[in-house]
């Protein structure tokens, strides 16, 4: 806490500029008006104050409200956002995709921070869902926030936004919120053709259950093994040699060479010697 | 040991067809798959298509898919490939290949298809 | 399909240098399941047909000398020469077998001074 003290003359600031960095801390208190400082906030970002400096200001802004700042405050806060603590953002209400962005660019290549997930949290909860746009932006910074939702959290996820997705957003789901994604990515690009559906679905399918895996055998998709091995075990283990075959098209000769592995290693154990021979891969059933 | 045959040299007339053998021998025919490979003079290498040879079932690069036709013989343990049509863009060196999984693990000494007049 | 981008095209190296050649896919070869990247490297010499050196990107294939090393994992790729012998003469390429069509790169001349 710093210590009320007036201030000396002639060093009241008239606005927020490079001379306020040579202010000590107690003339920053004493000089700054709080009011001032917050309808000129877009300005504190181009002024390289100490983190000391930072403080105050801060200081400042918390007694000028003390129930939780203004969009209009918060949207310019720049640099001073790294130095807010997860219970001031939980007194905000940040309603703009603008105000959103600002923030995340100042904490741009850093892991997400105990701030930055608070704040995204007010922010999708204020919401109510997680829109196309705001999940546009938030993979646009965190390529794995899909994945670090719950799937009770995913469930709020309209189907609509599901276009926003990209493959690598899902690199690190699991399969029970692959389980959540699947049946609104089927819903999302339900009225797209056979190829196209495919190349939209694929990043799903580790939700997908065996007869929609069933039915996609049958229309030439031409599966990789990398997304094949992503699938449900149990998704997979009742398809037929037949089945495995036409959905992975030329890829099934790799189950060769990832025979040791799940699922592919429990899929071969369920099948009959005579058909996996007619695979032409010498697998051992 | 594992040995892939192909004759040395195919010469033909442009619109013309060929038909490439690949003779297997060292291993058991049906448990590996065969692939096609082309090389034109001093370019890379260009993946034409991979056969099954226990079903027979053959899949194609979309570029490839008109021009060539992939075919065994279990019988004789002899891989094929019809390449019909053919213009000076198919004088190339083409490769048989056996797999070893994924990747190409044994390659046949290829045979040089000349297209002239 | 799937670029693969091979660098330099062309080297010159002596006798018992190391080297190192680049190839970079335009999408990750590696199956986050099993670990492997669908990755192998050939050397193919003068006159010959190629022959493979290295598969899920840093598996040597059996017979091949231990000087040769594969390293690199998603989308970017090395094969290194320890120590570069007279009969290392030829041209390196690497090809993706994730996702047909399998695709090479447009390979890695080494020329010997």
């Known amino acids: 806490e710093v210590e009320k003290t007036a201030c000396p003359s002639g060093k009241k600031a008239p606005e927020i500029d490079e001379s306020l960095i040579f202010y000590k801390k107690w003339e920053l208190e004493a000089c700054v008006d709080a009011a001032l400082l917050a309808t000129q906030m877009d300005r504190v970002n181009a002024i390289p104050f100490t983190y000391e400096q930072l403080d105050v200001l801060k200081h400042k802004l918390d007694e000028l409200y003390p129930q939780g700042y203004p969009e209009s405050v918060i949207q310019h806060l720049g640099y001073l956002f790294l130095k807010m603590s997860p219970e001031d953002i939980r007194k905000w209400n940040v309603t703009s995709l603008e105000t959103l962005k600002a923030l995340l660019e100042v904490n741009k290549g850093h892991e997400m921070s105990p701030q930055v997930a608070t704040l995204i949290d007010r922010f999708v909860k204020g919401r109510g869902q997680l829109d196309k746009d705001t999940l546009d932006t938030l993979t646009a910074f965190y390529p794995g926030y899909l994945c670090s939702l719950s799937p009770e959290e995913l469930s709020s996820v309209p189907p609509s936004s599901i276009w926003a997705v990209r493959p690598q957003d899902l690199d690190t789901c699991d399969p029970r919120q692959l389980d959540v994604l699947y049946p609104k990515a089927r819903l999302a690009f339900q009225n797209m053709n056979g190829s196209e559906y495919f190349v939209k679905i694929q990043s799903f399918l580790g939700g997908a259950p065996t007869e929609d895996l069933k039915a996609l055998s049958q229309q030439n998709v031409s599966m990789d093994l990398a997304t094949f091995m992503k699938l449900r075990t149990d998704a997979v283990l009742p398809l037929t040699v037949a089945e495995v075959q036409k959905l992975l098209g030329p890829h099934v000769e790799g189950l060769k060479a990832e025979e040791r592995h799940r699922p592919v290693r429990d899929w071969i154990l369920r099948q009959r010697q005579d058909d996996l021979d007619t695979l032409g891969l010498g697998l051992q059933g | 040991q594992v040995q892939l045959q192909q004759p040395g040299t195919e010469l033909v007339k442009p619109g013309a067809s060929v038909k490439l053998s690949c003779k297997a021998s060292?291993?058991?025919?049906?448990?590996?798959?065969m692939h096609w490979v082309k090389q034109r003079p001093g370019q890379g290498l260009e993946w034409i298509g991979n056969?099954?040879?226990?079903?027979?079932?053959?899949y194609y690069n979309e570029r490839f898919m008109s021009k060539a036709k992939m075919t065994v013989d279990k019988s004789s343990s002899t891989a094929y490939m019809q390449l019909s049509s053919l213009t000076s863009e198919d004088s190339a060196v083409y490769y048989c290949?056996?797999?070893?999984?994924?990747?190409?693990?044994?390659w046949g000494p290829g045979t040089l298809v000349t297209v002239s007049a | 399909d799937i670029v693969m981008t091979q660098s330099p095209s062309s080297l010159a190296m002596s006798v018992g240098q190391k080297v190192t050649m680049s190839c970079k896919s335009s999408?990750?070869?590696?199956?986050?399941?099993?670990?492997?990247?669908?990755l192998a490297w050939y050397q193919q010499k003068p006159g010959q047909s190629p022959t493979l050196l290295v598969y899920?990107?840093?598996t040597r294939e059996s017979g091949v000398p231990d000087r040769f090393i594969g390293g690199g994992s998603g989308t970017d790729f090395t094969l290194t020469i320890s120590s570069v012998q007279a009969e290392d003469l030829a041209d390196y390429f690497c090809?993706?077998?994730?996702?047909?069509?399998?695709?090479f790169g447009g390979g890695t001349n080494l020329e010997i001074k």
């Open positions: 060292g291993y058991t025919f049906t448990n590996y798959w």
């Open positions: 056969i099954n040879p226990s079903s027979g079932d053959s």
């Open positions: 899920f990107a840093s």
């Open positions: 290949a056996r797999s070893g999984g994924l990747w190409l693990a044994f």
């Open positions: 999408q990750t070869l590696l199956n986050s399941v099993s670990q492997n990247n669908y």
């Open positions: 090809q993706q077998h994730y996702r047909t069509p399998y695709t």
